[in-house]
Interface confidence: low
């Protein structure tokens, strides 16, 4: 019996087609993805093949103005329109709290939303009961397939799930649910979830009875053969893991942002054993037409976005200096504003010992592309912020050793004075440079804000200590020459859309007046 699994993950509100790098579509003839194009391909496959499942491995929420405005209603509407068969909860589904998940998505979705390792307690338990499930048995042709969900147990550090949801260890939580499916005579089981490729492989190895793992969170691109676009494969598609009980378990992920549709064909024998698996992600490029009915619906929903872009988010009573003459040479107040917003967006008081789990921010000055003049009545709009942060990136959480941070700050000024983008703006960090010293030895003082303290204060950076830092995904991926970050990071979790972080902060503060305050000094 043959099953076709179509899958997406980490779509991050890319409902409209995008450029090849998943930013805003500029030249339509070269654009990719989007739900209208996805629907065309899904329908084509559904017509051609008998047993098809369309699955999403989480993180539909967060990433563009679509989510900022519609807050998840757009996800439910268009996933319903595409007739998804199941979705796993990702960490970003909790970005607007549990309410922001329940109302727009859980209550509106016409497909099961799954997670076996999230347990509700207290008053929430009855409120959320049945709105998401640990597993779901889906009829497919003449057979049944069990789908069991999972979500990153790091979600409390990455999003806002509140105190009434407990995120258990994925493997511990999945095993009894898979066992339950076995007792129900379900012998074809897919683990669908959002914990990253390393955990996906562990689940394939450790959870007895899981036949296929469809994952997300790490934006992993797998491909067999010559890849069709710019993404570099982390391995072959499917990635085969040998389980502890000797089975070959295919593990798949489909990059992110709706650029690809994962396409996996699985052949099962009559006892539900995987005989063969093959496939590849399908690049959703302009050779695939956008479905006209979905496209018309997108255009209808778009109108509200255009209105939102020009509405006032808040006010500034000072000039927001985002000029390259400032931000690539010295501390600039636009850099301070953005870093303060990044830290504020990551406030998670999850432990009495810590005032927060993260206190530090770094931001490449070259990523700040425009100032904002206060003389326009002080008004700040989404449109203004899009000029400051035009690249559609995210502000991510990483864990780095102190020694890596030291290297990053040396790199920040290794060729100082040439208006290069690697000069770092900071938050929760005090750095002193001596430019008379040779490159690689210019950081003379590097103090960082403590987290395990009731009164935050600055202490010298310890080389061997592991620190959490918020930074742009561009830096996490080694951009602007920060190869040491990419090479030496100990953990990397994708965060929220950059503009959204800053706009939320400005809306919260209402009036802002960031200063240049001695975060970066030269001796």
């Amino acid at each position: 019996w043959e099953l076709t699994i179509l899958h997406t993950n980490d779509v991050h509100s890319r409902l409209e087609q995008t450029s090849e790098d998943s930013s805003k579509c500029v030249n339509a003839s070269r654009c990719m993805g989007g739900v209208a194009r996805l629907f065309t391909k899904v329908q084509q496959i559904r017509r051609a093949e008998p047993n098809v499942l369309l699955l999403d491995a989480g993180d539909q929420y967060q990433g563009t103005i679509w989510f900022t405005v519609y807050k998840g209603a757009e996800v439910a509407h268009f996933m319903n329109a595409l007739r998804y068969d199941a979705m796993a909860l990702g960490n970003h589904e909790f970005d607007n709290g549990v309410e922001g998940l329940i109302e727009p998505l859980l209550k509106e979705a016409k497909f099961p939303i799954l997670s076996a390792n999230i347990k509700a307690k207290g008053p929430l338990a009855s409120q959320i009961s049945g709105l998401y499930l640990p597993y779901k048995v889906l009829p497919v042709g003449d057979e049944v397939v069990g789908i069991v969900g999972y979500t990153s147990k790091e979600t409390p550090f990455l999003s806002n799930p509140g105190t009434n949801l407990v995120f258990e260890d994925e493997i511990t939580a999945l095993q009894p649910e898979v066992d339950k499916l076995k007792t129900l005579n379900v012998n074809k089981i897919i683990a669908l979830g959002h914990s990253g490729f390393e955990m996906d492989k562990l689940i394939a190895q450790k959870v007895r009875g899981v036949d296929v793992v469809v994952g997300g969170h790490s934006n992993t691109f797998l491909y067999t053969g010559n890849p069709p676009s710019k993404e570099v494969p982390a391995g072959k598609y499917p990635f085969i893991v040998t389980s502890d009980d000797g089975r070959k378990v295919p593990v798949v992920q489909a990059y992110a942002f709706g650029k690809y549709l994962g396409y996996l064909k699985i052949e099962f024998d009559e006892r539900g054993n995987v005989i063969s698996s093959h496939g590849n992600p399908i690049l959703l490029n302009s050779s695939i037409p956008e479905d006209p009915s979905i496209k018309a619906d997108i255009n209808k929903w778009r109108i509200k976005l255009d209105n939102y872009s020009t509405q006032e988010l808040g006010k500034t009573i000072v000039y927001l200096d985002g000029s390259s003459q400032s931000c690539r040479f010295r501390e600039c107040n636009m850099g301070n504003l953005i870093c303060d917003a990044m830290i504020n967006n990551n406030l998670r008081h999850t432990d009495e010992m810590f005032w927060n789990h993260v206190s530090m921010c770094i931001l490449n000055g070259g990523g700040i592309r425009s100032p904002i003049d206060e003389r326009n009545n002080g008004t700040i709009t989404w449109e203004n912020l899009a000029a400051v942060l035009p690249f559609g990136g995210t502000f991510d959480l990483v864990q780095l050793k102190g020694s890596t941070l030291k290297k990053a700050f040396e790199h920040s000024v290794h060729r100082y004075g040439q208006s290069t983008g690697e000069f770092l703006q900071v938050g929760g960090i005090h750095v002193v440079y001596d430019l008379s010293r040779k490159p690689g030895d210019r950081v003379v003082k590097l103090d960082v804000l403590c987290t395990k303290c009731r009164v935050p204060s600055y202490d010298p950076l310890k080389m061997d200590e592991v620190y959490k830092v918020i930074l742009p995904n561009f830096l996490a991926n080694g951009g602007d020459g920060f190869q040491m970050i990419k090479d030496e990071l100990l953990r990397h979790d994708s965060g929220d859309q950059d503009i959204n972080v800053v706009s939320t902060y400005i809306s919260k503060m209402k009036v802002i007046y960031p200063a240049v305050e001695g975060r970066i000094k030269f001796s």
Partner: antibody, heavy 117, light 107 residues
């Protein structure tokens, strides 16, 4: 750590065939394609072809289509290249190299093939 | 087949000097280009893939750039251990093809 072990040298007669081996260790053999590359003394590198150890799918350089046959033995995590109808033109160092990120990341030490009577 | 034209075929440079080697493809290869270093009697070592991505463990003094048909490898400050033969490879289309090599020697 990833290792690709190749025998140091092979001596064969003209007209004969030879089967060169490349034993992989330190990674999941079936997860990465294996390439073969030829290098003649004081000359550049030539790509012969590649094989997917998972399902034995192959891609050959047309120039070597009738010369080389690529195979694998999954049980021993070993890739093989059989070269037939050998002439002095086939005397060269032959490397196996694993593919990652679309290109070659780890190379074997190479086998020096000498075709001589 | 895509022809990769590498230049210069050989060069002498001084320690500490900035060195650039170029590779021109006969058609657009979409950044599917790698650079390798080979020392006498040794197998090649991969330095860069996708035109500009440095392989883990390769010194940061090496960098790659380019797009379309034209690519280059730069060594920011030549060191003694950088001498050897450098090859480019296109892996956009079968058959994969290498440049003719650049022999780099110390003055």
């Amino acid at each position: 750590q990833v290792q690709l072990q190749q025998p140091g040298a092979e001596l064969v007669r003209p007209g004969a065939s030879v089967k060169l081996s490349c034993k992989a260790s330190g990674y999941t053999f079936t997860s990465y394609w294996m390439n073969w590359v030829k290098q003649r003394p004081e000359q550049g590198l030539e790509w012969i072809g590649k094989i997917d150890p998972y399902d034995s799918e192959t891609h050959y350089n047309q120039k070597f289509k009738d010369k080389a046959i690529l195979t694998v033995d999954k049980s021993s995590s070993t890739a093989f290249m059989q070269l037939s109808s050998l002439t002095s033109e086939d005397s060269a160092v032959y490397y196996c190299a694993r593919i990652r990120y679309g290109t070659f990341d780890y190379w074997g030490q190479g086998t020096t093939l000498t075709v001589s009577s | 087949d895509i022809v990769m034209t590498q230049s210069p075929s050989s060069m002498y440079a001084s320690l500490g000097e900035r060195v650039t080697i170029t590779c021109k493809a006969s058609q657009d290869i979409n950044n599917y280009l790698s650079w390798f270093q080979q020392k006498p009697g040794k197998s090649p070592k991969t330095l860069i893939y996708r035109a500009n991505i440095l392989v883990d463990g390769v010194p940061s003094g090496f960098s790659g750039s380019g797009s379309g048909q034209d690519y280059s490898l730069t060594i920011s400050s030549l060191e003694y251990e950088d001498m050897g033969i450098y090859y480019c490879l296109q892996y956009d289309e079968f058959p994969y093809t290498f440049g003719g090599g650049t022999r780099l020697e110390i003055k």
